[in-house]
């Protein structure tokens, strides 16, 4: 069979949640492989995911070094088999990704309600402080460690017997709300970064209701 040309990658897309960051692209390779490079605006181009037939590359280890930096990636297409390189002067084809700033753009993962505790007519609801892959001094930081007061949580709560929802907000991971004595309530939380223009909100957490296992009740 005759030779074909290498094809440049296209549809380069960042997929990132809580800083776990993967670059995806097309097409599935035929007689070619890919190598990804990543750089900050002022840094070196670092090769990752060498000579791969995958169409994704996990770049988490690179972006967590400084989540406030802006990153650019590029995907090189290398001939591997009965193909010809279409780059000029032996240079391989490559395609650039959109710019990506993790702090501003990573999706907020679905939060989890860790616990709730009722004392009389007050309920304390605690949101799990999810661990990220961002490190400082060899320990992994939580979402709150990374975002600080930029991150708030919205609590949606309602009586099990009705559909009318109330909301509360906190810039910590805890809510203290007033409830009617003798009523069971259900809760759901959402992570929000109000200062953002994109990816401001997470999906809602799974609903947790009083009278189920996560709660503690004290008169």
């Amino acid at each position: 069979s005759g030779t074909t040309n290498t094809v440049a990658a296209y549809n380069l897309t960042w997929k990132s949640t809580n800083f776990k960051t993967i670059l995806e692209w097309e097409p599935k390779p035929v007689n070619q492989v890919y190598t990804v490079q990543i750089s900050t605006k002022s840094g070196d181009w670092k090769s990752k995911c060498f000579y791969t037939t995958d169409t994704e590359c996990d770049l988490t280890d690179e972006i967590v070094k400084d989540v406030k930096q802006t990153y650019l990636a590029r995907v090189f297409s290398y001939p591997a088999g009965n193909v010809e390189s279409t780059g000029s002067a032996g240079e391989p084809l490559y395609e650039n990704s959109p710019e990506f700033t993790p702090y501003l753009e990573t999706n907020l993962g679905q939060p989890t309600i860790q616990s709730f505790e009722q004392v009389g007519t007050k309920v304390n609801v605690t949101v799990e402080d999810e661990r990220t892959l961002v490190r400082r001094n060899n320990t992994f930081l939580s979402l709150r460690d990374v975002f600080g007061k930029d991150l708030i949580y919205t609590l949606y709560y309602w009586k099990s017997s009705s559909s009318g929802k109330k909301t509360a907000k906190t810039n910590t991971n805890e809510f203290l709300i007033d409830v009617d004595k003798g009523e069971n309530y259900c809760f759901s939380v959402q992570a929000v970064i109000p200062s953002r223009t994109v990816n401001r909100k997470s999906t809602d957490s799974p609903v947790e209701c009083m009278g189920q296992e996560k709660g503690e009740f004290r008169e």
Partner: antibody, heavy 117, light 106 residues
Framework: EVQLVQSGAEVKKPGESLKISCKGS????????MNWVRQMPGKGLEWMGM????????RLNQKFKDKATLSVDKSISTAYLQWSSLKASDTAMYYC??????????WGQGTTVTVSS | EIVLTQSPATLSLSPGERATLSCSAS?????MNWYQQKPGQSPRIWIY???NLASGVPARFSGSGSGTDFTLTISSLEPEDFAVYYC?????????FGGGTKVEIK
Amino acid sequence: EVQLVQSGAEVKKPGESLKISCKGSGYSFTSYWMNWVRQMPGKGLEWMGMIYPADSETRLNQKFKDKATLSVDKSISTAYLQWSSLKASDTAMYYCAREDYGSSDYWGQGTTVTVSS
Amino acid sequence: EIVLTQSPATLSLSPGERATLSCSASSSVSYMNWYQQKPGQSPRIWIYGISNLASGVPARFSGSGSGTDFTLTISSLEPEDFAVYYCQQKSSFPWTFGGGTKVEIK
């Protein structure tokens, strides 16, 4: 012109330590991964691992994990391969080679290490 | 790790003859290089990406293969072709070399 210049031949006794070097010039040293390859006398090539000079990330062949250490000094564009306690079986030619795509192919001239009592 | 087995270990041929060098991988490989090494010299990239000739490599050389079986072919041996040839896979870490094939003058 891209050049990789390695340090000279070494003769050592078992148990001694050693650090051999590979100095890069004619290119941005921090931008390219640097490979190390071993060739024992009369034998084939073995990939030991590689290091990225900008941040010292290493990819090491597990076979060499407890035997040798890769490091760099960015300020003098030099990569190092070192041993804390040499064995007779470390006797070999060691090459550094810049990680490149395709026809780009830059190797050091090799450093001969002889370990003998 | 992926083990590369080269055969034959030694190929004794005369100038003008055709040489066929094989490299068999223990699991599928998508990116294979070949290196030439002459006595007292560092290895040189000879074929990259299975079938692409490195700069300055004569057209009498060719590379082919896929999956686990790869071949370097020299259509008509010239005196300067007598050397050791190594295959190397870069599909998965650790990158590995074959044991080499020595092409010697018969």
